[in-house]
């Protein structure tokens, strides 16, 4: 009888499998695989080699704390003639003496997470078992049978593999691209993502069921949505919007997710201070990409926060057009969430593809602060019964705004306001380019189209179906040049009278600083004038906005809201126009000194010109970039930087990966906050 088969060691072929599975960056010490795809391993036996006629090899793969075959968290499978794609299977690739090369496959619907792989050998009545090692299984956008399959290689590269990108901020009329280091393959990030799954409340409540449900990107997306904020759990980020960030890091100061996730993991899953919508979205994007779900950050301009699902945001103003109070139902200048690509077997056909997931804690969904995934197509069709949270996301892009003016006698009158349309310029980074892609059309039919009316009817959006009033007088806020931080500049109320009558009016112009979520700050410019609008005439009335007025109260959003209220006493009518101005920060210049080569020191010279009338104090540059720096680096400039001159530092980089990388930079000082810059660097082989 043949002697017992004895395993000396197992080579998990980490590097080769990493290349095949697009996980090479994750595969330093661990085997990381994508589900539904073959992988290799080599068994080295002691004494004698494997003999098919006498030896039986059975593999075991388990995940989670309580593995079971019913839950799909435990599998046993034997060697077969060929691997069956889409199921747990194994076959022989090659045999040389005592060395057996095998090919294994995982199902395309296996739960993602950490697995333990074991081998049982039996020869006659003798048997032994061996631990082969651990591997991590991720979603697979390259596998047609996987729920996250994406058939474009360029899109897979962008939405799964690309570690850097842009998040769009600013205002609808001045869209600002902010570079971000997602860094989903950086050291420790995969561990943090798996830990995030393992501390989520659903896991703590029912570990076995949670691990089983990790086979679904819908489930995982919803868990991530809830875990990126810390409102109900040991989530990653604490949200704060009040401009008091002294005991943490200002949301505007972050330049990447890596630092955030590392802090969270290293401090025992304690909340990281502080996040706002784009930080929540960016961290969710990192986590989802890391787990293998194609994901992108999107920005919706003039985003509504509708709490009572009436698709209506009502503002009450006094006779001067000033808001009576800051309330929770508001229009945010912009709001960010993520979209993840997946099938929706739980929904009707046609609702697969991009799903909106919003990790910013706004409203509870099924008792938890999370939102989505909801089919973007369902939003476009006005199908508000769709899981999950369709009505909330529909409102974010479609709510109507009504302005009421409370007159001195206490009565309220509706004001006409055509300047604010909710859900505009919905933006994401283009595939493979540093440009913005407008994806508004994926959420909304063209304004005024029959399809749009049909959607509003289906969604019972009565306000949007009402005819708009026209008075023959129109007003809009226009801007001049030089709207950058440190400058004085003019804005104009442009008023047109398209009627045959003369109109006696009063114009109240006011500029106030504003946070990106719509909360108003102090006034920084006003004008109150009486004017006569001649028939068929156009008027342009300027409002001067001075640096000395806005400098002390501008938030890190760099936004100023200009409001014009045109009152016509004779007709007892009010016409309102608003515009959000984004003040451009100075440009960060980045020069690369030397030739960028892999595993060789590289120096970046980073500079910024002081645009203000006084010196800049307490200046700090912070840089990071996946493949360029092991961790974030900060360089302080202890000496003041006088007006008009540059602040300049040199930073040592150590590129580890060849190819295209982005060096992302943040600059902070006393009077300039969260100035961002980036530079593309192509690293060549050594």
């Amino acid at each position: 009888m043949a002697e017992e088969l004895n395993l000396e060691r197992c080579d998990l072929e980490i590097q080769a499998n990493g290349r095949d599975h697009h996980t090479a960056d994750l595969c330093q010490e661990k085997l990381v695989l994508r589900r539904g795809q073959r992988f290799r391993l080599t068994l080295y036996f002691e004494g004698r080699g494997y003999e098919a006629s006498v030896d039986r090899l059975t593999f075991g793969a388990v995940t989670g704390p309580d593995p079971s075959e019913e839950a799909g968290t435990k599998a046993r499978f034997s060697l077969s003639d060929d691997v069956e794609e889409g199921s747990w299977s194994a076959s022989v690739l090659d045999q040389q003496d005592n060395v057996l090369s095998l090919q294994l496959c995982t199902p395309a619907n296996a739960p993602v997470g950490q697995y333990r792989l074991s081998l049982e050998t039996s020869t006659g009545y003798q048997g032994s078992s061996f631990m082969l090692g651990h591997f991590i299984l991720l979603f697979n956008a390259w596998c047609p049978a996987d729920d996250v399959y994406l058939d474009s290689e360029a899109e897979r590269r962008e939405y799964v593999l690309t570690q850097q990108g842009f998040i769009y901020q600013g205002s609808v009329k001045f869209i600002k691209s902010v570079p971000w280091n997602f860094g989903q393959f950086e050291d420790g990030i995969l561990d943090a993502c798996l830990m995030l799954l393992d501390v989520n409340p659903k896991f703590l409540k029912d570990r076995s069921r949670d691990c089983s449900r990790r086979s679904s990107p819908i489930y995982v997306g919803r868990v991530v949505s809830g875990m990126v904020n810390c409102n109900d759990d040991q989530g990653v980020l604490l949200g704060r919007w009040d401009n008091n960030y002294g005991d943490g890091i200002s949301p505007m100061a972050w330049i990447g997710s890596v630092d955030i996730l590392r802090r969270w993991k290293e401090h025992g899953c304690q909340q990281v201070k502080y996040g706002q919508c784009w930080v929540f979205a960016a961290v969710a994007c990192t986590v989802l990409r890391c787990l293998g779900i194609p994901t992108r950050v999107v920005t919706n301009y003039n985003s509504a926060h509708d709490q009572n699902s009436n698709l209506l945001i009502e503002y009450f103003r006094n006779e001067y057009g000033e808001l009576e109070s800051n309330k929770s139902e508001m229009i945010w200048n912009f709001h960010c969430w993520v979209e993840s690509w997946m099938t929706r077997p739980d929904l009707q056909p046609g609702y697969e593809g991009w799903q909106a997931i919003d990790p910013t804690p706004q409203e509870k969904s099924e008792g938890t602060y999370c939102c989505g995934p909801v089919s973007v197509r369902a939003i476009k069709e006005g199908d508000l019964s769709t899981k999950y949270d369709a009505s909330f996301v529909f409102a974010e892009v479609n709510a109507d705004v009504v302005d009421w003016i409370r007159q001195s006698d206490g009565s309220v009158l509706k004001s006409i306001n055509n300047s604010l349309v909710v859900g505009q310029k919905i933006s994401t980074k283009s595939v493979g380019r540093d440009d913005r892609e407008d994806i508004t059309y994926t959420y909304k039919y063209p304004e005024g189209s029959p399809e749009e009316r049909e959607v509003f009817t289906r969604a019972n959006h009565l306000n949007k179906l009402a005819e708009k009033e026209e008075t023959g007088v129109a007003m809009r806020i226009r801007v001049g040049d030089g709207m950058s931080l440190g400058n004085d500049f003019d804005v104009f109320a442009h008023i047109g009278n398209d009627t045959s009558e003369s109109r006696e009016c009063r114009l109240l112009l006011c500029a106030r600083t504003v946070s990106y979520n719509g909360v108003l700050g102090p006034e920084c410019g006003t004008e109150d004038i009486n004017l006569t609008l001649d028939p068929y005439s156009e008027n342009s009335i300027p409002l001067r906005i001075l640096y000395e007025k806005y400098s002390g109260c501008l938030t890190e959003s760099n936004l100023i809201k200009v409001r014009g209220l045109l009152v016509e006493p004779a007709a007892n009518s009010y016409l309102l126009a608003e515009r959000d101005l984004y003040l451009e920060n100075p440009e960060i210049k980045i020069r690369i000194l030397g030739e960028p080569k892999q595993n060789r020191k590289l120096v970046a010279e980073v500079s910024l010109k002081n645009p203000l009338s006084d010196s800049l104090y307490d200046c700090v540059f912070t840089v990071e970039g996946a493949g360029l720096t092991k961790e974030q680096k900060s360089v302080e400039v202890s000496d003041p930087v006088p007006a008009g001159d540059a602040v300049k530092v040199r930073v040592d980089l150590f590129p580890t990966d060849i190819g295209l990388h982005k060096l992302v930079v943040n600059f902070q000082c006393d009077k300039l906050k969260s100035v961002k810059g980036y530079r593309n660097i192509i690293i060549g082989p050594a």
Partner: antibody, heavy 114, light 112 residues
Framework: EVQLQQSGPELVKPGASVKMSCRAS????????IHWVKQKPGQGLEWIGY????????RYNEKFKGKATLTSDKSSTTAYMELSSLTSEDSAVYYC???????WGQGTTLTVSS | DVLMTQNPLSLPVSLGDQASISCRSS???????????LEWYLQKPGQSPKFLIY???NRFSGVPDRFSGSGSGTDFTLRISSVEAEDLGVYYC?????????FGGGTKLEIK
């Protein structure tokens, strides 16, 4: 017109503390830092430190740490310097200034004498 | 700290003469951005100092063109091409490149 108006002369006993003021007008107070400079009788100028009214951040010459405390009050557009544990060595004229410009206070004379 | 040393301590001149005052720093006062923030001030008896020159050689507005500054690295000079009575007083150099900022000891310009 930009002006820095300093408080009047002080005569104090050794060991005591004194707080002198510098009221700024004619410009936005939070836009510029205010420096303090010491000049002992018949001697040269010595930089004490600055206060940044924008964020209340102060930087000091190491020599004056523990001796001088710089603060500011936005509502009254006033910068203050408090000097503690006074000795005769602290007798001097103290100027507030917006350095790198021609805006200086008229000086506050401090005499420390028992 | 950067030590600023002025020479001479006292400079007697006749009206109409040229005057040169030297200022030497104990180490380079070039800022990390490449600029040198070396300034000159004039203090007349009983008055606050007046601002004359910034960034080594730039005259502040209203300063007569008989005043000129030069130098680099650690050696700097203030020149008055033709001294007038209103120029008398104590001249101070000042470095604003590195905290703590420092003044020179002063040079007294007086009539011979």
């Amino acid at each position: 017109e930009v002006q820095l108006q300093q408080s009047g002369p002080e005569l104090v006993k050794p060991g005591a503390s004194v707080k002198m003021s510098c009221r700024a007008s004619g410009y936005t107070f939070t836009t510029y830092v205010i420096h303090w400079v010491k000049q002992k009788p018949g001697q040269g100028l010595e930089w004490i430190g600055y206060i940044n009214p924008y964020n209340d951040g102060a930087r000091y010459n190491e020599k004056f740490k523990g001796k001088a405390t710089l603060t500011s009050d936005k509502s009254s557009t006033t910068a203050y310097m408090e000097l503690s544990s006074l000795t005769s060595e602290d007798s001097a004229v103290y100027y507030c200034a917006r350095l790198s410009s021609d805006y200086w206070g008229q000086g506050t004379t401090l005499t420390v004498s028992s | 700290d950067v030590l600023m040393t002025q020479n001479p301590l006292s400079l007697p001149v006749s009206l109409g003469d040229q005057a040169s005052i030297s200022c030497r720093s104990s180490r380079s006062i070039e800022h990390s951005n490449g600029n040198t923030y070396l300034e000159w001030y004039l203090q007349k008896p009983g008055q606050s100092p007046k601002f004359l020159i910034y960034k080594v050689s730039n005259r502040f507005s209203g300063v007569p063109d008989r005043f000129s500054g030069s130098g680099s690295g650690t050696d700097f000079t203030l020149r008055i091409s033709s001294v007038e009575a209103e120029d008398l007083g104590v001249y101070y150099c000042f470095q604003g490149s590195h905290v703590p900022f420092t003044f020179g000891g002063g040079t007294k310009l007086e009539i011979k």
